[in-house]
């Protein structure tokens, strides 16, 4: 392990396709890759009228814009779909919305995704 | 280095099966998820199957649904398609290829190919 | 399922020009964007994934943008080997699809 880095081993796994993709919903995805990769965990959600929707979480391979970020922290302003990515176990249990842009309200998690 | 093999292709007649392989090398095939791709002859490239690096999820195209089965066998590094009901819209070259995880398809190794003709 | 709309189909360039290629999604994806260069006869190749991350041993001429539905192939300076059918695909929901392909031609 480099000095200073978190090293991902496994993330939050969501799928809300999880029937039409035949997976689970929930549950810890162990992350693989080359060794010479680096490995993060995501999270994908939707802000439908004030209400949080997950999309997907899960592992996400060698990003540079994952790089060193302990927090799941979307930066983007307003986007359609929100995305954010970590390094660390687990990271992507918590996420959150801070455009860089203007000051707003985060949105806080973890969430309880809806039942099918 | 990695390398992924494919074989099993060939001439088979309308409502037959095939079964393809992709032998896999060089490097740990029970860490990726692993999927199949297809192209007919002077066309673009269509998804057909995924699987996790477990076998625990697999998920399909519509277009192939009931019809094919994707599988693999860890200890044999080996990953399968078994093809029932073949039409001729199935003719296509096949192509296995590997992804880390199950949402981050990225396909970042794939085999030669393998030539699948349906026709009687 | 969501569409991949490539542009343009085909295009003629010369070795050292600036080449390109978008591909558009028919909703976001988020940065679920990934490139692909095929050859005749030949498997695709991976270019960029993640929109914009350089795979493996890819020369750095190639580069990829763009986020939401609307996304970029750049290739700096073409070279005579990077004449081939270039492929978009996203991975943000399944089926996966790919774009058409643009073919990339000597003029």
């Known amino acids: 392990a480099i000095l200073g880095r978190s090293e991902t081993q496994e993330c939050l796994f969501f799928n809300a396709n999880w029937e039409k993709d035949r997976t689970n919903q929930t549950g810890v995805e162990p992350c693989y890759g080359d060794k010479d990769k680096r490995r993060h965990c995501f999270a994908t959600w939707k802000n439908i009228s004030g209400s949080i929707e997950i999309v997907k979480q899960g592992c996400w391979l060698d990003d540079i814009n994952c790089y060193d970020r302990t927090d799941c922290v979307e930066k983007k302003d307003s986007p359609e779909v929100y995305f954010c990515c970590c390094e660390g176990n687990m990271c992507n249990e918590k996420f959150s919305y801070f455009p860089e842009m203007e000051v707003t309200q985060p949105t806080s998690n973890p969430v309880t995704p809806k039942p099918p | 280095e990695v390398q992924l093999l494919e074989s099993g292709g060939g001439l088979v007649q309308p409502g037959g099966s095939l079964r393809l392989s992709c032998a896999a090398s060089?490097?740990?095939?029970?860490?990726?998820?692993m999927n199949w791709v297809r192209q007919a002859p002077g066309k673009g490239l269509e998804w057909v199957a995924s699987i996790n690096y477990n076998s625990g999820y697999t998920s399909y195209a519509d277009s192939v649904k009931g019809r094919f089965t994707i599988s693999r066998d860890n200890s044999k590094n080996t990953l399968y398609l078994q093809m029932n009901s073949l039409r001729a819209e199935d003719t296509a070259v096949y192509y296995c290829?590997?992804?880390?995880?199950?949402?981050?398809?990225?396909?970042?190794?794939w085999g030669q190919g393998t030539l699948v003709t349906v026709s009687s | 399922d969501i569409q991949m709309t490539q542009s343009p189909s085909s295009l003629s360039a010369s070795v050292g020009d600036r080449v390109t290629i978008t591909c558009r999604a028919s909703?976001?994806?988020?940065?679920?964007l990934n490139w692909y260069q095929q050859k005749p006869g030949k498997a695709p190749k991976l270019l960029i994934y993640a929109a914009t991350s350089l795979h493996s041993g890819v020369p750095s001429r190639f580069s990829g943008s763009g986020s939401g539905t609307d996304f970029t192939l750049t290739i700096s300076s073409l070279q005579p080997e990077d004449f081939a059918t270039y492929y978009c695909?996203?991975?943000?929901?399944?089926?996966?699809?790919f774009g058409g392909g643009t073919k990339v031609e000597i003029k």
């Open positions: 695909q996203q991975s943000y929901d399944t089926p996966l699809t």
């Open positions: 060089g490097f740990t095939f029970s860490s990726y998820s």
């Open positions: 290829a590997r992804s880390a995880n199950w949402h981050d398809t990225h396909l970042d190794y």
């Open positions: 909703q976001s994806i988020v940065s679920y």
